[in-house]
């Protein structure tokens, strides 16, 4: 299936050109998205471009600015949030990145109704997290790895905890590895509905082994950045639940919530916090070994002052064949009912899809089946539930949005986006407002993004928010590569594939293949989305086959593609990109002497893998700050998927998988070995740790470190990082400069 | 009805040690936060020491930190001061209240503890 | 730590009459943390009115309380023989919490 074709056609070819890297790295063919900040069940405030903060209301079609950009302009503000009670607007300024979601700012509160700003009380800084509550204008904040609450914005503070030690504990924002690899989130707090309560909760780091790596910065002495990390089999954080009364919290103090006894007889992880309504809430926990997930619904019992989670609203899932859930465990979507949830899990054919539960697991009724997976579920009204899926057309690289109308029986089910733009669109996601009034969809490809605003009851299509038309025009002129989504059946195993060919790709010619991977358990490389990026150039301009391939381990294909790989990270993923370069070798177009693989982290450790797997299918390979071992790497992470590092557990597997057991192999292979120093996640001594079996194995390779750099390699590292290794690659396909 | 009843107290020399309870009855004990208040002879009310509910948290006043020990049992709706180190200024009525900072709405009848040589 | 001053130290009325008792705090408290407390002699404080200025349970409806930011007043709209004691006020916003130093109303 040809899912962009190129616009070439030879009279028109003089005036085309092909993509350079100058492009990529200038993001000259970046997209932009269109998400409104919904604020009711009609209304949405948008950030113009020239940066005023204006209230749309769909239904009256009028338009204004709330907040200029001469006052954003004031305080240098990047972003903002507007209070439930629309009395006040907070303006965040000073961002300041740590990790992947966490950051630190400065906070200034804008009093709408006298255009001043709050004077008197002002917020300490940094802060570590902000945000108002659900109703009127209370503000919860996290200062110093504490929690502050003000009532109102010109009141003192009420701090809430008092423990908070910097790399010790942590209230109301997540540790390292619970924001990495558990909550992806920068907080650790949530509001109930009405905010009456606030919930949050704490870690304790006190007994977490620690990395620490240098960091050069242009000082005498390099500093040392420290950071509690619990690699695999070692200690982890001590996670705490707890709920104050936020109308007066000086009484009562924090409620602890107690873990379901299950749960808290062996090391155990606490996975979100939903609220279902101001006094009932919902808690997932998660045994350490995690093919165990406890779903516990807790209730404020108002005589007691305490909140009471009986065991008959304990909801157990467990996974047999793997780990519970897929990436994370899914979270419950409740209904009206207040008690009953809609929740995302495997059917008893292994397949991931939306089950009903009113009583108890086993009697869950399953709202969606087939040999496709749910992936998300947006939003449950009273009559309707939006979910995305990938059942259409049996593609798994594919996202549309159905509704299922629940207030009929049977149910019935309406696929949304499936022919609004079928070319153009075949991978969304959606925003939806206040009881699902109305909803933007945003559409990521194949074709250029494009978002909508749509009517929630009738789904009609009301305007276009953004369609990228300056994009569309200026890639008129450019020779885009063509791009084919295909599977191949291998054993059993359907390994579909992306393959991102020359503009003027001529099958009975021979190109350069080069393999980009990821590979890990719960990815997907092959999606039905637009990017001009640095492999579009090496198709454009370097001629080069570029191919993504999904193979065993891999997401939203069913459990048994999914847990293949459990317990045995790096065999299952590395065998199936070598079968399917061999079957790309039979399609007669690969230049078998001139093949290459690439990956970043996961992908760094599989391309690693695959360069020594003594194939002999790979000329050279890059690997971009890779794992080597999975001892280096996150607990939490890790051990979802191998178990633990010790002897009666997996310890063999966890030796037998590692990159420097397969030194000997890279002999025959060029080998470009890539790292930032101060990578907090894949840390640098796993590269180094490559480099020294190398060393030892007296194995030539080629490395490049960036100093200061973390996993990402951004700024201007990212521009010299593809250059190297556009030069790597050109030279190993015999590419002239 | 609610009820706090303070044990405990009595002559102790400077340096030496004391353990004041509190019987509660009349709520549910392990919801609520605790607190001992003082009350030096002719003096005002000063706030010592205060535990939440579970008892996995526990605050104290500068002037008893490293002292002092706030504890409960849950399961006997008991709560306990550990008094170590006492000095003459620590002399005072003790109190039990229940409340964590605050809107302390009950209170036991108190307990002297009188810190002399 | 936040210093709560009353005033004044002693307040001499005769029953039936209005008392007005203030708290000044050395910075920013707001009602939603500011407690007052009757004492008698020989007597554990007694809650009058709880944090947000609401009467505590079993309070008559003469004593209230008012008040934000750093300045508050307990009122008695009419003495009865009973409520001559000393009256304590208390901020919870801030650790440690703190008392007065009370002010004691006396028989005129």
């Known amino acids: 299936i040809v899912l962009r074709p190129s616009r070439v056609h030879n009279s028109e070819e003089n005036t085309m050109r092909a993509l350079t890297l100058k492009d990529i790295l200038n993001g000259t063919f970046s997209y932009k998205t269109f998400f409104p900040n919904w604020i009711s069940g009609q209304e949405y405030l948008h950030q113009s471009a020239d940066n005023n903060i204006v209230l749309y209301n769909i239904e009256t079609g009028q338009s204004y600015t709330i907040l200029s950009n001469r006052t954003m302009k004031s305080v240098n503000a990047s972003n903002y949030g507007l209070s439930p009670d629309r009395q006040f607007v907070y303006l965040e300024s000073d961002y300041s990145k740590l990790w992947r979601y966490s950051y630190t700012a400065t906070y200034y509160i804008y009093d709408l109704s006298n255009g001043e700003f709050v004077r008197g009380n002002e917020l300490p800084r940094p802060i570590q997290y902000l945000c108002w509550s659900p109703v009127g204008s209370k503000l919860a904040y996290v200062y110093q790895n504490n929690i502050y609450l003000k009532q109102r914005p010109g009141d003192p503070p009420f701090q809430i905890t008092f423990n908070g030690r910097e790399n010790k504990i942590f209230n109301g924002i997540p540790d390292w590895v619970y924001e990495e690899e558990m909550l992806a989130t920068k907080y650790a707090l949530w509001w109930s509905p009405n905010g009456k309560f606030l919930a949050y909760a704490e870690f304790n780091d006190t007994d977490i082994p620690v990395i620490a790596y240098s960091y050069y910065g242009d000082e005498q002495y390099p500093r040392t950045i420290n950071i509690p990390y619990p690699k695999a089999g070692a200690k982890n954080p001590v996670v705490r639940i707890f709920i104050i009364d936020t109308t007066y919290p000086a009484y009562v103090g924090p409620q602890e919530v107690p873990v379901p006894a299950m749960i808290a007889s062996s090391d155990y992880y606490f996975s979100w916090l939903t609220w279902v309504t101001d006094e009932r809430v919902c808690l997932q926990w998660l045994k350490r070994v995690q093919n165990v997930s406890v779903l516990s619904i807790c209730d404020f019992r108002e005589d007691w002052q305490t909140w009471d989670c009986p065991k008959t609203q304990e909801h157990i899932e467990e996974s047999r064949t793997g780990w519970a859930g897929g990436f994370f465990v899914s979270t419950p979507v409740f209904s009206y009912d207040a008690i009953s949830y809609y929740k995302i899990f495997s059917d008893k054919d292994g397949y991931k899809h939306i089950h009903y539960i009113k009583d108890t697991v086993e009697n869950a009724i399953q709202i969606t089946s087939g040999k496709w997976e749910a992936i998300n579920i947006f939003r449950v009204t009273q009559d309707s539930l939006f979910y995305s899926s990938n059942e259409f057309e049996e593609y798994p690289g594919r996202r549309n949005i159905y509704r299922i109308s629940i207030g009929s029986y049977p149910p019935s089910k309406k696929c949304v986006t499936c022919h609004l733009r079928k070319e153009r669109c075949q991978y969304y996601t959606a925003s939806f407002s206040d009881y699902a009034k109305y909803y933007a969809l945003v559409c990521y490809g194949p074709g250029i993004p494009i978002s909508t605003l749509h009517d929630g009851r009738t789904d009609q299509e009301i305007k276009i928010l953004e369609e990228n038309k300056e994009l569309e025009n200026a890639l008129k002129n450019i020779q885009l590569p063509k791009e084919e989504i295909k599977k191949l059946e291998v054993d059993e195993i359907t390994l579909w594939y992306k393959m991102i060919l020359p503009p003027q790709f001529d099958r009975s010619k021979k190109y350069p293949l080069l393999i980009q991977v990821y590979g890990g358990p719960c990815s997907q490389s092959v999606r039905s989305v637009f990017a001009v990026n640095w492999i579009s150039y090496l198709a454009s301009k370097e001629g080069m086959v570029i191919a993504l391939v999904d193979g065993r381990g891999t997401a939203f294909q069913g459990d048994k593609l999914l847990y293949a790989v459990y317990r045995k990270l790096g065999v299952y993923e590395v065998e199936d990109q070598i079968t399917a370069v061999r079957k790309f070798i039979e399609m007669g177009f690969i230049d078998e002497k001139r093949i290459a693989i690439w990956g970043w982290s996961y992908g760094g450790y599989v391309s690693s893998l695959a360069l020594a797997s003594g194939t002999g299918l790979f000329k050279c390979g890059i690997a971009v700050a890779p794992v080597s071992s999975w001892e280096y790497y996150a607990s939490v992470y890790t051990e979802r998927f191998m178990g633990l590092p010790t002897k009666d557990d997996n310890l063999e597997h966890y030796k037998n998988s590692t990159v420097m057991a397969r030194a000997e192999y890279f002999r025959n292979v060029d080998y470009l070995l890539i790292h930032g120093t101060a990578d907090d996640n894949v840390h640098f001594q796993n590269s180094a740790q490559i480099a020294k079996a190398l060393v030892n194995a007296q194995v030539d390779f080629q490395a490049m470190w960036y100093s200061d750099q973390n996993h990402g390699l951004s700024g201007l590292s990212t521009n010299h990082l593809y250059t190297h290794m556009t030069h790597f690659l050109k030279q190993c396909f015999s590419l002239s400069d | 009805e609610v009820q706090l009843l303070e044990s405990g107290g009595g002559l102790v020399q400077p340096g030496g040690s004391l353990r004041l309870s509190c019987a509660a009855s009349?709520?549910?004990?392990?919801?609520?936060?605790m607190s001992w208040v003082r009350q030096a002879p002719g003096k005002k009310l000063e706030w010592v020491s205060a535990?939440?509910?579970?008892?996995?948290?526990?605050y104290y006043a500068d002037s008893v930190k490293g002292r002092f020990t706030i504890s409960r049992d849950n399961s006997k709706n008991t709560l306990y001061l550990q008094m170590n180190s006492l000095r003459a200024e620590d002399t005072a009525v003790y109190y039990c209240?229940?409340?964590?900072?605050?809107?302390?709405?009950?209170w036991g009848q108190g307990t002297l503890v009188t810190v002399s040589s | 730590e936040i210093v709560l001053t009353q005033s004044p130290g002693t307040l001499s009325l005769s029953p039936g009459e209005r008392a007005t008792l203030s708290c000044r705090a050395s910075?920013?408290?707001?009602?939603?943390?500011l407690a007052w407390y009757q004492q008698k002699p020989g007597q554990a404080p007694r809650l009058l009115i709880n944090?947000?200025?609401r009467r505590a349970t079993g309070i008559p409806d003469r004593f209230s309380g008012s008040g934000s930011g750093t300045d508050f007043t307990l009122t008695i709209s009419r003495l009865e023989p009973e409520d001559f004691a000393v009256y304590y006020c208390?901020?919870?916003?801030?650790?440690?919490?703190?008392f007065g130093q009370g002010t004691k109303v006396e028989i005129k």
């Open positions: 209240a229940k409340g964590w900072f605050g809107g302390f709405n009950y």
């Open positions: 009349g709520f549910t004990f392990s919801s609520y936060a």
């Open positions: 535990i939440i509910g579970s008892g996995s948290r526990t």
């Open positions: 910075q920013s408290v707001t009602s939603s943390y």
């Open positions: 944090v947000g200025s």
């Open positions: 208390q901020q919870g916003i801030m650790l440690p919490p703190t």
